[in-house]
């Protein structure tokens, strides 16, 4: 089984949509925005709904020039983001406080450059273990109702926990349809056994699964975005099945409770 990474990567797509067999998995990155290719199936929240404005002030967009969103990210400190390691690019921009996918100016938006990207040293392309990366911004954010950090949970998720995942990834799969505004989706954490049953020999303790039975899922372009449970950041969108939102094929998320020490130490060492 090949994996479906949920980044939207127009530049070097691991599995362009016209070559990915049904029932494979991919990273959930994408190529959304002004320049999205119509055949790039790499990003989305499926069967979610428009987020309420100002409710996800930690949500960031990682942009390739000119305005192509390729991954989500999460503000976890006034000058640091978390995202998926598979979203690493050398040149990108960061947009915070923005609700719509289009590059139209919004009064709450704040734009940044990433001055340092630090993938977890245990991440191995094109695998999925330890799929997280810290990005240092070129300056501290200005805290507002639209832009503020979220705390990373030090408690690991238990089965049945209700969480919210968000992103601008494609809202259809295997077709591609990017949303106008940030999408939100309620999902439930699944037991590790159900996760391992869904993806035999592919799951370890740096991952957890979440989803529901009604065909709701994250998808390409959502990669690196937040999974928020009980008010704190529990996970990052990482990978899943292709097409997204298939029965018994939940989304797979980076299990951040395993990395709180690395996150804190890396931020301290590079501040």
């Amino acid at each position: 089984v090949t994996e479906h990474v949920l980044a939207n990567n127009d530049v070097s797509c691991d599995h362009p949509s016209n070559t990915v067999p049904s029932g494979s998995n991919q990273d959930l990155g994408a190529g959304a925005g002004e320049d999205a290719r119509s055949d790039d199936s790499s990003s989305r929240i499926i069967n979610g709904s428009d987020c309420d404005m100002h409710t996800q002030p930690w949500q960031a967009a990682l942009l390739l020039r000119p305005n192509q969103l390729y991954c989500g990210a999460v503000l976890v400190h006034p000058q640091w983001l978390l995202t998926a390691a598979h979203c690493r690019k050398k040149v990108f921009r960061v947009r915070l406080g923005h609700y719509s996918l289009s590059p139209v100016y919004e009064s709450g938006q704040q734009m940044f450059q990433g001055v340092k990207s630090i993938p977890h040293p245990g991440y191995s392309h094109p695998g999925h273990s330890n799929d997280l990366m810290l990005i240092k911004l070129n300056r501290r954010i200005r805290p507002t109702k639209d832009v503020r950090p979220i705390n990373v949970s030090s408690h690991c998720p238990s089965a049945g926990t209700k969480c919210l995942v968000s992103g601008w990834g494609t809202t259809k799969s295997p077709q591609v349809h990017f949303p106008k505004v940030l999408q939100c989706l309620n999902i439930s954490v699944l037991s590790q056994k159900r996760c391992e049953d869904a993806y035999p020999r592919q799951i370890d303790d740096t991952m957890f699964c979440a989803g529901d039975k009604a065909g709701r899922d994250s998808c390409q372009g959502d990669s690196g975005g937040p999974v928020v449970c009980n008010g704190s950041l529990q996970g990052l969108v990482s990978w899943g099945d292709y097409p997204c939102a298939r029965p018994n094929r939940p989304g797979v998320y980076t299990n951040l409770c395993k990395f709180t020490k690395w996150i804190q130490e890396t931020i301290q060492a590079n501040s």
Partner: antibody, heavy 117, light 110 residues
Framework: EVQLQESGPGLVKPSGTLSLTCAVS????????MSWVRQPPGKGLEWIGD???????DYASWAKGRVTISVDSSKTQVSLKLSSVTAADTAVYYC???????????WGQGTLVTVSS | AYQMTQSPSSLSASVGDRVTITCQAS??????LAWYQQKPGKAPKLLIY???TLASGVPSRFSGSGSGTDFTLTISSLQPEDFATYYC????????????FGGGTKVEIK
Amino acid sequence: EVQLQESGPGLVKPSGTLSLTCAVSGFPLSNYAMSWVRQPPGKGLEWIGDIYPSDIIDYASWAKGRVTISVDSSKTQVSLKLSSVTAADTAVYYCARDNNDYGLDIWGQGTLVTVSS
Amino acid sequence: AYQMTQSPSSLSASVGDRVTITCQASQSISSWLAWYQQKPGKAPKLLIYLASTLASGVPSRFSGSGSGTDFTLTISSLQPEDFATYYCQQGYTNSNIINTFGGGTKVEIK
């Protein structure tokens, strides 16, 4: 066609400043990071530094304080200045483009700079 | 400090041979490793990036593997045009780095 072309004096006096430019054509500098790399005669490749579209610059630890990398206002040239040169700085100097996945996919042909009085 | 060590520094091989070059990082660089080929008097050419992704136009006899600290470049069946020097380069970090490149491996005709 995507191309990089280094140019500058082939001979620099010891203690002087080495100045090179890299002319960029076929792609926008605003989308890519650029690197300078050098190769002393008969030796291996040495990374000098990177410049990003945001004008963030990373230098090799040996080059800090001696090297300046910049992009001209027209965004069509990348320049390298290396001060207080010695014979050990004699090398072929290359500029290269990063493919955005941490691989240098386009290189200039290189220019030999000799430090000698 | 991250240092890249290549081995061997040189090797002799014949056309058709399977050739393996290794690159070791002093600390984990995850998968951010590139391989280059350089022929005398020419600029280096990108062969592989992200440890295993083949660059555009590079023949499939070249392959890369590894993650963390240990990486390998393999030429499955050496061709006459493959006699050259090969370099690895880490892209994990630029902080306090003396050199991102390994020392090189020269592949010569036996």
